[in-house]
Each structure stands twice: as C-alpha cells, then as structure tokens.
Interface confidence: low
C-alpha cells in the first residue's frame, strides 16, 4: 500500500519515541565514529522534518524515500572524509547505490574505546539526572559497536536497561540489585548481536533462499503443528523483516516486525499452543517472547516421510513442477519431526536430498536411483552427534577455562595466521558451548551446540573478512553456510605455516595483571597460549600444559610478592628461559 510520505507513515505507525530511537540506531550503525551529540542533532532534525510531513504529507521533500532522506542527512556530516576516508565517496552516489555503499562500510570491529562500567552511584546519578540522554547514550554505544544489532530488539534491551535502573537506583543495596542485571543484559546483548550477525551474513553472502531455508527449518521445529502454508507465510514475512533490518531499513523492519507479532498472536490457534503467554505481553516483550518461544509439542500422528519423498512415483514430477516448494515441504516435514537436530544438520540433509534428486531425476530409473537416499543421511547425522559427545566429555573433564584452552590450541594450529585477539575471542566463545549445551539432555544438545557454533564461527568469518589472512578460513567461510562447522572441524594442523619469530616482549608481564578481573586474567593467559602455539605449532599438549602450569604458578607467586614488579621482571626472565627450553625454541 503506497503512502504519499513514507517518513510520515513510519512516524505515525511507530510513534515519536520509537521513531527517534530507531533513527538514532540507524545513524550510529552507519557512522560508528561520530560523537553522540552529532547523532542526537541529526536525529532531532530528522524528527522535526517527519513532524512537518505528518502535518502535511504533500510538503516539500516528504515524498522522498527514507534512504534518500537519511542518506542526505548523513552526508551533511562535515568531518565525513577525515573521519571515515573513502566512505565519504558514498555521498557522490545516487540511491540505491549510496545506501549499498554505506552498508559495505559497516565495521564489525570498530576502533572504539572499551566500554568501562562506572561506579553504580555514578550511573544512578546520570540516570536520575537525565534519563532520556542516559538511555539514548545506551542505544548509541551499543549500536555503534554492533552495526548489525537487530534494532527492534535493541529497543527491548533499552526498555530492560531502563527498568533495571528505575528499580535498582532506589534499592538499599544498589550494586547488588543492578550489577547482576547489567551483566545479564551485557551477555544477552552480545549473544543477540552475534545471532543477528549470522542472519545478516546469511542474507548478504548466501542470499534470500539460504535464509528462507534456515527459517523454514527453525519455524517448523518450533511450530510443528502449523500447516506448511502457515509456516511458509511466516517465513516470507520473517525474511522481509530481517532483510530490512540487515539492509539498514530499521523503521520498516520494526514496523513489519510488530505486524508479524500481531499476525502470529491473532492466529496462534493455527500456529502453536505455546504462544498464549507471549501474546499477553506489550509489543517489545511480545516480539522477543515469540522469537524465543519453546518448541510446541509435535503432533502425535505424523506419518513416515518415505511415502511422499522416496516411495512415491511422483517424486520427480513434484520436484520438477516446483523445486523450491517441494524441497521446502521436505525440510518442513523433516524439521517438525526432528527438534533434536540442529538447523544446520537439517539443511545439510535437505541439500543432500536436493543433490540426489537433481542427479536421479535425470537417470534412466529415477526411483531405483533415489531409493536409498536416506542411507546418505546417516553419516551426516552421526558426525555432529559424535563430535558433541566427545567435546562434552572433554568439557566435563576439563571445565570451561581448560576446555577453552584446548580449543585455543586446536584452532591456532588449524589457522595460525589469524590474529591472536580474534583467535582468543572466538575460541573462548566456542568453549562456552560446554556450559551452555552439555547440561542439556541428549535430545536438546545438538540444536543447542551446533547452531550456537554456527553463530560463533560466523564471528570468525566476519572478523576475518575485514582483514583476510588465511585461505583456509576464507574457504570454510564462503563455500557453504551450513558446512562451515564441519569444514573447520576437518581442518588439520597447517603444515605450510612458518612459525612466528620468538619475541620475549610477548611473554613479559607486569604487576597490573594482579588487579585484573578473573576473566581478564584468563584472557592474558590465553593470549600467551596462542602466541606459544604460533611460535611452536608442533608443541605437544603435554609441553603446552607444562608451560601454562608454570605460567599460572608464576603469576600467582608474583601477585603475592611484596615487590610485585621486581618479581615479574626477575621471575619472568626465568619463565621465558624455562619455556623456551621446554618447547625446544
């Protein structure tokens, strides 16, 4: 339905508060280095303009597209070239090329200062002093550091952030109330950002078809009682929402997401029995709740898939008539029956089925050719099952920190060219799969573990894409979205790697390590471990364990010493010498 003024349409649909917040997020995600006050100024100007269009949709420029209006506004930033370099060239382009250009310059790892959490009193003071600015600042800081954060979900996080401060700044023990809530929001926020980043990578690198396949599988697992036509409708709408958000069309995205939540709740009887509680909540909570809702119970009377997809003589006819619809039905039927499978496994199975039909439907006896297709699925199912079993056993044996270290060594040997901070970040996140998923019963382990690993490996892929250093990473990241994890799992030690020169400075530590949090201290040690492996890629587990044990003892000893700095200097030299000897460097 065409509107005379798109900006007026969205302003009226979303309301002023959400409109301003979403425009701020959009601008911060595009111009990640701009100061907060500059963005606030731009947002206020856009908002004032939108209000004139609401008053008179025929007013000058009100008929322009949102991309044109927002792009024109971003291109008024005086310091664009000096701050962003070649991104300024985007402003010479016309829409839609200009927006595509801005999208290409989004930086997944912007050079921004680490967000340091101040004292609780300081935060409460700031919150009480100017609540609106405080919350805008939160949106700005998250959006600029996470340029693909799902904007309507960020509004939900901001609402929870506000609620935490409203409650806790009045509490007797403010810190005890607030800090756990902020930790939870931070951790959930990082996870949400990474999950959305995978959705955007799926759409942008592999296309709409890949995203739709993912959505069919996931929604079929979640809503196994829904008809295929219903799931297809939801997939189409969900794809539109995520395409818009990943494309920077945040107003349309938020508006369409609200419409989708409304539709789901109005039709919950034909979708899922688990939606009742979600649908009683306010909009932001409702949308979040629906996105996280547990799988509905599977219908009790589902027939075997064999009749329709292997035994029927019409398989090739049905496939030829509408390939993607037929494959979609296969994926839907498979997924609704297998909530115990990861989405990526279901997609591998569907791909195998597609490849088999492509080959067999051109053969002399198609049925004879594809009759044993299900036999090809077995190794595909067993591979992640075995991998998860082995890794959960290792996790239970080692605990999270040492499990992370095992993965650090494993991945550094696979792709030693990757930067140390990226290897540490990715391996730490890979290691979190243990505490996240191994506690689950068998039936929930694979969807938890393998789909989480897909999210983490996508972080590696997007970080590596910014500065490509390894052909092996590029290959695993670009060949197949659903086979990324098996591709990385299959990598052996990189025999072509020339070990890094030994640099004593890398292994020089100071007393400041003693004041770090446990997490930061772990990262320091894990950074040293990656560097060790880069120096000596053929080092055995035992050698590395010995060196790391010595290192832990050294840190503990010097942190207890009266003259810490002297201890770190003297004992550090001894440790470096002993480590070199132990590793034969």
């Amino acid at each position: 339905d065409a509107h005379k003024s798109e900006v007026a349409h969205r302003f009226k649909d979303l309301g002023e508060e959400n409109f301003k917040a979403l425009v701020l997020i959009a601008f911060a995600q595009y111009l990640q280095q701009c100061p907060f006050e500059d963005h606030v100024k731009l947002v206020n100007e856009v908002t004032e303009f939108a209000k004139t269009c609401v008053a008179d949709e025929s007013a000058e420029n009100c008929d322009k597209s949102l991309h044109t209006l927002f792009g024109d506004k971003l291109c008024t930033v005086a310091t664009l070239r000096e701050t962003y370099g070649e991104m300024a060239d985007c402003c010479a382009k016309q829409e839609p090329e200009r927006n595509e250009c801005f999208l290409q310059h989004k930086d997944d790892n912007p050079n921004l200062p680490r967000l340091v959490r101040p004292e609780v009193d300081v935060m409460c003071t700031a919150f009480h002093d100017n609540e609106e600015t405080f919350l805008k600042k939160y949106l700005y800081e998250i959006a600029r550091r996470h340029p693909y954060f799902y904007a309507p979900e960020l509004l939900f996080f901001a609402k929870r952030y506000k609620a935490a401060f409203t409650e806790c700044c009045q509490a007797a023990d403010k810190a005890a109330c607030l800090l756990p809530k902020l930790d939870e929001l931070r951790d959930e926020g990082k996870a949400s950002s990474a999950k959305q980043r995978l959705k955007c990578a799926s759409l942008q690198k592999f296309g709409e078809r890949a995203f739709k396949a993912w959505a069919v599988a996931r929604l079929s697992q979640r809503f196994p009682k829904a008809e295929f036509a219903e799931v297809s409708k939801l997939v189409t709408d969900l794809t539109k929402v995520h395409t818009e958000c990943c494309h920077g069309d945040l107003l349309e995205c938020a508006d369409d997401r609200a419409d989708l939540a409304k539709y789901i709740c109005e039709n919950q009887d034909s979708i899922s029995s688990k939606l009742k509680e979600c649908c009683e909540k306010p909009l932001l909570e409702k949308s979040h709740c629906i996105a996280e809702v547990e799988n509905d119970e599977m219908p009790a009377d589902l027939p075997s898939l064999a009749a329709d997809f292997v035994e029927s003589k019409d398989v090739c006819k049905n496939y030829a008539e509408a390939k993607d619809v037929f494959l979609g039905m296969f994926l839907y039927e498979y997924a609704r029956r297998h909530p115990d499978y990861s989405v990526v496994l279901l997609l591998r199975l569907a791909k195998t089925y597609e490849t088999t039909l492509e080959k067999c439907c051109a053969a002399a006896d198609p049925h004879e050719c594809y009759a044993k297709v299900f036999d090809e699925f077995k190794p595909l199912v067993e591979e992640p099952q075995n991998l998860i079993k082995q890794n959960c056993e290792l996790f239970e044996q080692l605990g999270e920190y040492k499990f992370q270290n095992a993965l650090l060594v494993r991945y550094t040997k696979k792709v030693p060219q990757v930067s140390t901070p990226t290897l540490v970040e990715v391996s730490r996140n890979l290691g979190k799969v243990g505490s996240k998923c191994c506690k689950h019963p068998e039936a929930k382990r694979m969807p938890c573990a393998e789909d989480y690993l897909s999210v983490v490996l996508n972080q590696l892929c997007v970080l590596h894409e910014k500065t490509p250093v390894s052909d092996r990473v590029t290959k695993c990241c670009t060949e197949s979205l659903v086979n990324r994890r098996p591709c990385f799992s299959a990598l052996e030690v990189d025999e072509t790697y020339v070990p890094k020169e030994f640099n004593a400075e890398t292994f020089t530590f100071h007393a400041d390590i003693c004041t770090l949090s446990e997490k930061e201290r772990q990262i320091k040690k894990q950074t040293a471990l990656v560097e060790l492996v880069k120096h000596k890629p053929k080092a055995t587990k035992e050698q590395l364990k010995a060196v790391m044990d010595d290192f832990a003892a050294f840190v503990e000893k010097c942190c207890k010493a009266d003259d810490k700095e002297t201890c770190f200097a003297e004992e550090g030299k001894k440790l470096v010498a002993a480590s070199q000897a132990a590793l034969g460097l």
Epitope: P35, F36, E37, V40, P113, V116, R117, P118, E119, V122, M123, C124, T125, A126, H128, D129, N130, T133, F134, K136, K137, Y138
Partner: nanobody, 124 residues
Amino acid sequence: DVQLVESGGGVVQPGGSLRLSCAASGSTISSYVMGWFRQAPGKEREFVAAISRSGGYTYYADSVKGRFTISRDNSKNTVYLQMNSLRPEDTALYYCAAGRYSAWYSQSYEYDYWGQGTLVTVSS
C-alpha cells in the same frame, strides 16, 4: 561551544585547604555534567569529582572522598572544588571538564570540553 577557565590553584601546606573555581562562558552549564580531573607529573589523568546538571548528585574518587567537595552555581555559570586536608599526593594540574551527554561521569572521554588547568602544589 563552552570555554572553561580554572582558577584558585597555588601552593599550600599539607593539611591546608584550597577552593578551585571553574568559570564557563559561551554556553550555560546547566545542561552539562561538570567534572574535575587531575594529572600529576609523569602520571595519567585521573578523575577527581563530578556533579550532575542539577547539582543534586555528586561523585568522588576514593582518594578524595570526605576531603573534597564539588558544587556548582548555575546562575553564575561556575563550578567549585573545595579541597580540605590536602596531602602531598594531591599535587597536580587540576582540570575542569564539561560533558553535555556524559552518562559515565568518571570517564574522561565522555567530556566534551576541557579547561587549561590550574596547578595545585601541596608542600611543606
């Protein structure tokens, strides 16, 4: 833009007092969080104290709590730092800072405008 000019620094004996002032011009300070930072020779700049826009909320570094008091008079466009029980380790260049959108009062990068500083020397 806001221009900030500090005054009131000088030489004082340990245990003595000083009152620093920060006069703002170019804009009213009522819409700014105001803070004091200091930098001793050879050390990094550190947070001392900050006050909210309304003046109703203050925050101090642990090292100065109970000894220093920050206040503001928005009608005079001025911020003050009353420093009592001064110690030799308080010797530093003291800077006044203003942050329009400072959420994190103790983080120097949140402040948009800075004065040139006034020197405080505590020595017997």
